[in-house]
């Protein structure tokens, strides 16, 4: 018979074919894993299911962003009786199955991490063949990617009344603190706009008025490191132009 129940592990409404009272569908994932940009991470995911000794076709899937509807980043399929889950999808070739789905393990390795990978991931298993059933983690695992600061843009821009302003944009996690130094400035935190909407790891600092010619240096720092970059302002006196 078919029944619907609430799974307490994932607090997920799930319909299952009831075949044995010994086990039920559940998924075990940690709330969060952390790793540094450029390194690798492991997203653990194990599950239990009610279909004892199931050896039919199965598919393992990982999604990003949101459960059920989020884009797939990894998918593999194992034929009946096979221990090998053949990869059918690995986004950018960076997702690799570590676990053996036949042994209830869907754990995934993510290589060459980038700050853009900082999101929630959801594992899912699908049974086909004699038994048709599927289950997906609802809460997923948050991948927290940390990164030393990197200055992505530094520039001098014209502003009204023949003046100039400087902008420095850096990325990092934790979001870096930015400081400007330069002629007659000392060390200035300047006008920090952080983090930008939809760009959670980007921080921008502005020097609204560059009053002296010379070298202006932006320094970005967080608990993982620091980075700096400079721009030069040289105005042609008697003219309205500037060289940077």
């Amino acid at each position: 018979f078919v029944r619907t129940k609430i799974d307490t592990t994932e607090n997920l409404l799930n319909t299952e074919v009831h075949s044995s009272p010994a086990q039920r569908w559940s998924m075990q994932v940690p709330p969060e894993v952390s790793a540094e940009a450029g390194d690798a991470a492991v997203l653990p995911c194990t599950f239990t299911h009610p279909h004892r000794h199931y050896d039919g076709p199965l598919t393992a899937i990982w999604r990003a962003g949101e459960p059920y509807a989020g884009p797939q980043v990894f998918r593999c399929a194992a034929a009946r009786g096979s221990e090998l889950c053949q990869t059918a999808l690995s986004l950018h070739g960076r997702f690799r199955l570590l676990g053996n789905p036949r042994r209830n393990d869907l754990s995934l390795r993510v290589e060459r991490l980038a700050l853009a990978d900082d999101r929630r991931y959801f594992c899912r298993v699908e049974f086909a063949g004699d038994v048709h059933d599927r289950y997906e983690s609802r809460h997923g695992v948050r991948l927290h990617v940390t990164a030393a600061p990197r200055i992505v843009n530094i520039s001098v821009l014209p502003s009204p009344a023949h003046a100039f302003r400087a902008l420095c944009t850096a990325e990092g996690e934790p979001p870096p603190a930015l400081a400007w130094s330069g002629p007659a400035l000392g060390n200035s935190l300047a006008a920090v706009r952080s983090p930008r909407e939809g760009h959670g790891h980007l921080v921008t600092a502005e020097l609204p008025a560059l009053t002296h010619d010379g070298r202006y240096t932006c320094t970005a720092a967080n608990s993982l490191g620091r980075s700096e970059a400079s721009v030069y302002l040289f105005r042609f006196h008697g003219a309205s132009g500037a060289s940077t």
Partner: antibody, heavy 121, light 111 residues
């Protein structure tokens, strides 16, 4: 039965080139990553290169000691793995093993018997 | 790159005895409980053979007297009771970070 059979080894002068081949059988070659691992006479094992499969865009990886000199490639239609070795040095003298690895793990679950490359003048 | 150090270089034991081989990595090779360390056996004139993968998983066809343990930087291969065919060279290998690196090997010889 999984089988990996290497060929192409031999004696070559320093600065010369050699192309090793590995014929695979007994498994679906397309599903696996393939590697070359070498062992200098009386020494330990050294991983040389890896080539991934189609899903992983045939990405290649090399040990620093051979990068720029060696090229790993595969021909899935022929179930074959290759290692093109250029600018050979005396320290490249070794038995070269072809080894298979699963897409999920960079360990080597099956190995060939190896082919000896000797670089000497 | 990650440096793998095995000890002892040689282990002299008798058949039936317990063998304990150590492997130390220069940095942690464990991520989220997964240890990227693997063990191989090599006999003279033969190719290596996978014994243990990811620290503690027995490879296909390997007898249960072989076991692996450890986490972080320190790992152990144990042979519970040595059989005559177990006298050979043993290597550990890490796949935590490319390039994949091997230890220098431990030779298990008959005492």
């Amino acid at each position: 039965e999984v089988q990996l059979v290497e060929s192409g080894g031999g004696l070559v002068q320093p600065g010369g080139s050699l192309r090793l081949s590995c014929a695979a059988s007994g498994f679906n070659f397309n599903d696996y990553f393939m590697n070359w691992v070498r062992q200098a006479p009386g020494k330990g094992l050294e991983w040389v290169a890896q080539i991934r499969n189609k899903i992983y865009t045939y990405a290649t990886f090399y040990a620093a000691s051979v990068k720029g000199r060696f090229t790993i490639s595969r021909d899935n239609a022929k179930n074959s793995l290759y290692l093109q070795m250029n600018s050979l040095r005396a320290e490249d003298t070794a038995v070269y093993y072809c080894a298979r690895s699963l897409t999920g793990g960079d360990y080597f679950d099956y190995w060939g018997q190896g082919t000896l490359v000797t670089v000497s003048s | 790159e990650i440096l793998m150090t095995q000890s002892p270089a040689t282990l002299s034991l008798s058949p039936g005895e317990r063998a304990t081989l150590s492997c130390r990595a220069s940095q942690s090779v464990t991520i989220s409980g997964y240890s990227f360390i693997h063990w191989y056996q090599q006999k003279p004139g033969q190719a290596p053979r996978l014994l243990i993968y990811r620290a503690s998983n027995l490879a296909s066809g390997i007898p249960a007297r072989f076991s692996g343990s450890g986490s972080g930087t320190d790992f152990t291969l144990t042979i519970s009771s040595l059989e005559p065919e177990d006298f050979a060279l043993y290597y550990c290998q890490q796949s935590r970070k490319s390039p994949w690196t091997f230890g220098q090997g431990t030779k298990v010889e008959i005492k």
